[in-house]
């Protein structure tokens, strides 16, 4: 009896999630008579995987026919492996007893590791937009991978970033793992078309890393620069005052003309021109009838961009001077807007 050995030839077996695992086990003798049972883990918390004698184990099939008289192969196949199946499996011989069978000898165990792919990385940026020169944080998360070893890199427009912190959880042993990384990115005025990429490499991906992206267009706010100029028009008593709103992003913008502090007109940016860097330009003009004014007029172009506090630029219109002698002609950028006469 003492001569019986339970042989588990494989110290370890690695299987991809979704595949079947074969766990090998042979006995060196037919004596003592009694069933084989398979367990995962050791100690009082060990889990019954298969009992040759009784029970229903839908995911487990035997490799050979255990009903054959001289069978000494007790290998099993476990189907549709998931990360939760990872662990050490023991093939244990029981000796027939009364009223209960008694554990006789155990195999040395086979460690089953499960290779599971990480989920597609999800990159999320800050809740609120930020302006150039500010540093913003992006997070990248991927879940459900095994084994624990994983590599995560950050890129901005193809350039690798170095300012980031990464954690893999949990710290101890687990059936599967999650990775969480936070990268810091300094915004520039040219970042409307920029992308931040989180790249995850894992043994299950066969050298083809997974990527998650975030467009900085969702994160950046480029505040506009304003320029107010005046040009003469054909009629000597009229002056065209333009407000050029340049290099802003996103498009959401409202412009108000003030005449000596009083609201003259409010309009929303509609027909904008897009610059190569993804920012926008827009121009509004005001047709001023100077003959209707005795005193000088202070014209203010006030812009509220993307819900931020208004910025403004003013222009003093001297009514005493001849219109044709004032301002400079920069009509080349006139992209059009409404006209308004002030009477």
């Amino acid at each position: 009896e003492e001569g019986l050995q339970v042989i588990q030839p494989d110290k370890s077996v690695s299987v991809a999630a979704g595949e079947s695992a074969i766990l090998h086990c042979t006995a060196t003798s037919l004596i003592p008579v009694g069933p084989i049972q398979w367990f995962r883990g050791a100690g009082p918390g060990r889990e019954l995987i298969y009992n040759q004698k009784e029970g229903h184990f839908p995911r487990v099939t035997t490799v050979s026919d255990l009903t054959k008289r001289n069978n000494m192969d007790f290998s099993i196949r476990i189907g549709n492996i998931t990360p939760a199946d990872a662990g050490t499996y023991y093939c244990v011989k029981f000796r027939k007893g009364s009223p209960d069978d008694v554990e006789f000898k155990s195999g040395a165990g086979t460690e089953l590791s499960v290779r599971a792919k990480p989920s597609a990385p999800v990159v999320s940026g800050p809740a609120a937009r930020a302006t150039p020169q500010h540093t913003v944080s992006f997070t990248c998360e991927s879940h459900g991978f095994s084994p624990r070893d994983i590599t995560l890199k950050w890129f901005k427009n193809g350039n690798e970033l170095s300012d980031f912190q990464t954690n893999v959880d949990p710290v101890g042993e687990s059936v599967s793992y999650s990775i969480h990384s936070t990268a810091k990115v300094v915004l520039t005025r040219e970042d409307v078309h920029s992308q931040v990429i989180c790249e995850v490499a894992h043994v299950t991906l066969q050298g083809d890393p997974l990527r998650g992206t975030a467009n900085l267009s969702e994160t950046i706010r480029v505040p506009p620069t304003l320029e107010v100029t005046q040009q003469p028009v054909r009629a000597e008593n009229q002056v065209n005052v333009t407000c050029q709103v340049r290099k802003f992003y996103p498009q959401r913008l409202q412009l108000t003309w003030l005449e000596n502090g009083n609201v003259s007109r409010t309009e929303t940016a509609s027909t904008v021109t897009e610059n190569k860097d993804g920012t926008y330009n827009w121009m509004s003009w005001l047709l001023v009838n100077v003959s209707a004014h005795r005193d000088d007029v202070k014209l203010t172009c006030q812009v509220e961009h993307d819900g931020q506090p208004a910025v403004s630029k003013s222009h003093d219109l001297k009514v005493s001077a001849h219109p044709k002698e004032q301002g400079s002609n920069t009509a080349a950028e006139n992209t059009g807007s409404n006209e308004r006469n002030i009477y």
Partner: antibody, heavy 122, light 107 residues
Framework: EVQFQQSGTVLARPGTSVKMSCKAS????????MHWVKQGPGQGLQWIGA????????TYNQKFKGKAELTVVTSTSTAYMEVSSLTNEDSAVYYC???????????????WGQGTLVTVSA | DIQMTQSPSSLSASLGERVSLTCRAS??????LNWLQQEPDGTIKRLIY???SLDSGVPKRFSGSRSGSDYSLTISGLESEDFVDYYC?????????FGGGTKLEIN
């Protein structure tokens, strides 16, 4: 009917050892892990460790390694626990209980002994 | 080690009242949780196993449930013999750990 009969109250001196017993009846002794649990005066329950009578396999709570030693005598279906180097901290009621030879939900800690009171005093 | 945080540590209630005791697990224990009852003389009895399965001979006014990492024992319609101590126990992972206990007292 499954029963665990534990040995009686013990008064012991600091620095000495005590050995208590838990005799099982009513089922196959070798099909179960025997566990020991400590309850200090006015305190909660702490798992000490367990022993498997088939092969004397033991597992301990790290806090009790070197403090408690578990043994069994299969022929009498009796589990023993020896607590050594006694201090006041070891004054407690010690319970035995059991779980099946594998993790079967219905068999975890169903039956309990009545407890053995150990008082450590100079 | 898995910590089992049991609340409340003591509870005053009246006969016929419905009460709930809770244990929160610091790590995933699945459904591997028992509820135990301890009499003043030290006798320990298991009431619930596997989170919600009632032991034979235990009155139906006892029930167990789970919400995420929170495990509850509910006694609907307290009777005089219910005013004792209660413990939860996780048996998912060694070392097996108990909650700190709840002393149920009569109002």
């Amino acid at each position: 009917e499954v029963q665990f009969q534990q040995s009686g109250t013990v008064l012991a001196r600091p620095g000495t050892s005590v050995k208590m017993s838990c005799k099982a009846s009513g089922s196959t002794f070798t099909s179960y892990w025997m566990h020991w649990v400590k309850q200090g005066p006015g305190q909660g329950l702490q798992w000490i460790g367990a022993i498997y009578p088939v092969n004397n396999d033991t597992t301990y709570n790290q806090k009790f390694k070197g403090k408690a030693e578990l043994t069994v005598v299969t022929s009498t279906s009796t589990a023993y626990m020896e607590v050594s180097s006694l201090t006041n901290e070891d004054s407690a009621v010690y319970y035995c209980t059991r779980s099946f030879y594998y993790s079967l939900d219905a068999a975890w800690f169903v039956y309990w002994g009545q407890g053995t009171l150990v008082t450590v005093s100079a | 080690d898995i910590q089992m945080t049991q609340s409340p540590s003591s509870l005053s209630a009246s006969l016929g009242e419905r009460v709930s005791l809770t244990c929160r697990a610091s790590q995933d224990i699945g459904s591997r949780l028992n509820w135990l009852q301890q009499e003043p003389d030290g006798t320990i009895k298991r009431l619930i196993y596997a989170t919600s399965s009632l032991d034979s001979g235990v009155p139906k006014r006892f029930s167990g449930s789970r919400s995420g990492s929170d495990y509850s024992l509910t006694i609907s319609g307290l009777e005089s013999e219910d005013f004792v101590d209660y413990y939860c126990l996780q048996y998912a992972s060694s070392p097996f750990t108990f909650g700190g206990g709840t002393k149920l007292e009569i109002n």
